[in-house]
Amino acid sequence: QSPPGKPEIHKCRSPDKETFTCWWNPGTDGGLPTNYSLTYSKEGEKTTYECPDYKTSGPNSCFFSKQYTSIWKIYIITVNATNQMGSSSSDPLYVDVTYIVEPEPPRNLTLEVKQLKDKKTYLWVKWSPPTITDVKTGWFTMEYEIRLKPEEAEEWEIHFTGHQTQFKVFDLYPGQKYLVQTRCKPDHGYWSRWSQESSVEMPNDFTLKD
């Protein structure tokens, strides 16, 4: 039996700059029941607070609701592990909520096969920003990527689309079914997970015009 091993803060993420969650990896438990607590202070302030909500985001996590989230403050976060033999603390993590945003994926992914006047066909991919994103006010600006592949293929083809919420993909194989996904990233922050797949079959012959 021994004191607990040092826990490690795995990551902190915010979906929208309004709330955030931090997750940690427990260290070894020293063969004894071990309690974990997350404490934090805000840069420039002396007061230390304990995690307001250990339940919402699941095991080994702390959820900060709107009430506890400030975007102009740096949080100094530590996880403490305690058992009967002693305690240990993680290295502190400095968190600026502006820089930890991982949004929900884009939505309303639509796929349309189109044809240019020269008979060249292309796939027109369109989508909308994630629901929580207030793009117009500048609170968020998102950059996007799409990826697609033939249904049977292993490797995805990725296209960066900047701030555009549409993209034309040329040179696709007729008769082939393609899977398409999109994801987004705020100016400061992390890529969202990929959206659900949408699929489209490229026609063998195509007679419609734009």
């Epitope: 960066f160 701030h163 993209f167």
Partner: antibody, heavy 120, light 107 residues
Framework: EVQLQQSGPELVKPGASVKISCKAS????????IHWVKQSHGKSLEWIGY????????GYNQKFKSKATLTVDNSSSTAYMEVRSLTSEDSAVYYC?????????????WGQGTSVTVSS | DIQMTQSPASLSASVGETVTITCRAS??????LAWYQQKQGKPPQLLVY???TLAEGVPSRFSGGGSGTQFSLKINSLQPEDFGSYYC?????????FGSGTKLEIK
């Protein structure tokens, strides 16, 4: 005919700021990205950043993030780049360029360039 | 950031000759490569994008090739107006970066 008309040459003092304009015509301004590119005398090209007028979204080269600010005025189809805290390293020709309407990063039409000279 | 290495730095050739300029990306950029021509005192002009697609109005003696990390620009039957500087640029994802340029001079 697509045209990008940039403002005239600037002679500015170290520490000052300069705001360069790029007036677009001949296409729907909000449908295309506007990029800004720096070319120091006799040197290669450096991408500064871009702005998408449709939603004011910007992307910057980290090197220029604290040096340049990109904005647009959609009512006049004009893009602007402000360069601040100027030093002799900022003396260069600055170009605005239109991004291809589909692929973000290739630039199909260019302004004539604005020469900025920083000197006391 | 993705580095673009262009070669040669300079090149002398005669009217009517064929020349090839190469560009190497420090990582896979698929086909996201553009080529520009620049004349003294003028802005660059787009020649090729997506590695091999000729921009509008560009003569067919220009051709682009390659994918992944290795790319080339070939100019067949050089004309007097082809002399100047050439730059490659990746347009895969931000930050977009340019090669250091190739100066093509008349022999």
């Amino acid at each position: 005919e697509v045209q990008l008309q940039q403002s005239g040459p600037e002679l500015v003092k170290p520490g000052a700021s300069v705001k360069i304009s790029c007036k677009a015509s001949g296409y729907t301004f909000t449908d295309y990205n506007i990029h800004w590119v720096k070319q120091s005398h006799g040197k290669s090209l450096e991408w500064i950043g871009y702005i998408y007028p449709n939603n004011d979204g910007t992307g910057y080269n980290q090197k220029f993030k604290s040096k340049a600010t990109l904005t647009v005025d959609n009512s006049s189809s004009t893009a602007y780049m402000e360069v601040r805290s100027l030093t002799s390293e900022d003396s260069a020709v600055y170009y605005c360029a239109r991004g291809d309407g589909n692929y973000v990063g290739d630039m199909d039409y260019w302004g004539q360039g604005t020469s900025v000279t920083v000197s006391s | 950031d993705i580095q673009m290495t262009q070669s040669p730095a300079s090149l002398s050739a005669s009217v009517g000759e064929t020349v090839t300029i190469t560009c190497r990306a420090s990582e896979n950029i698929y086909s996201y490569l553009a080529w520009y021509q620049q004349k003294q005192g003028k802005p660059p002009q787009l020649l090729v994008y997506n590695a091999k697609t000729l921009a509008e109005g560009v003569p067919s003696r220009f051709s682009g090739g390659g994918s992944g990390t290795q790319f080339s620009l070939k100019i067949n039957s050089l004309q007097p107006e082809d002399f100047g500087s050439y730059y490659c640029q990746h347009h895969y994802a931000t930050p977009f970066t340019f090669g250091s340029g190739t100066k093509l001079e008349i022999k």
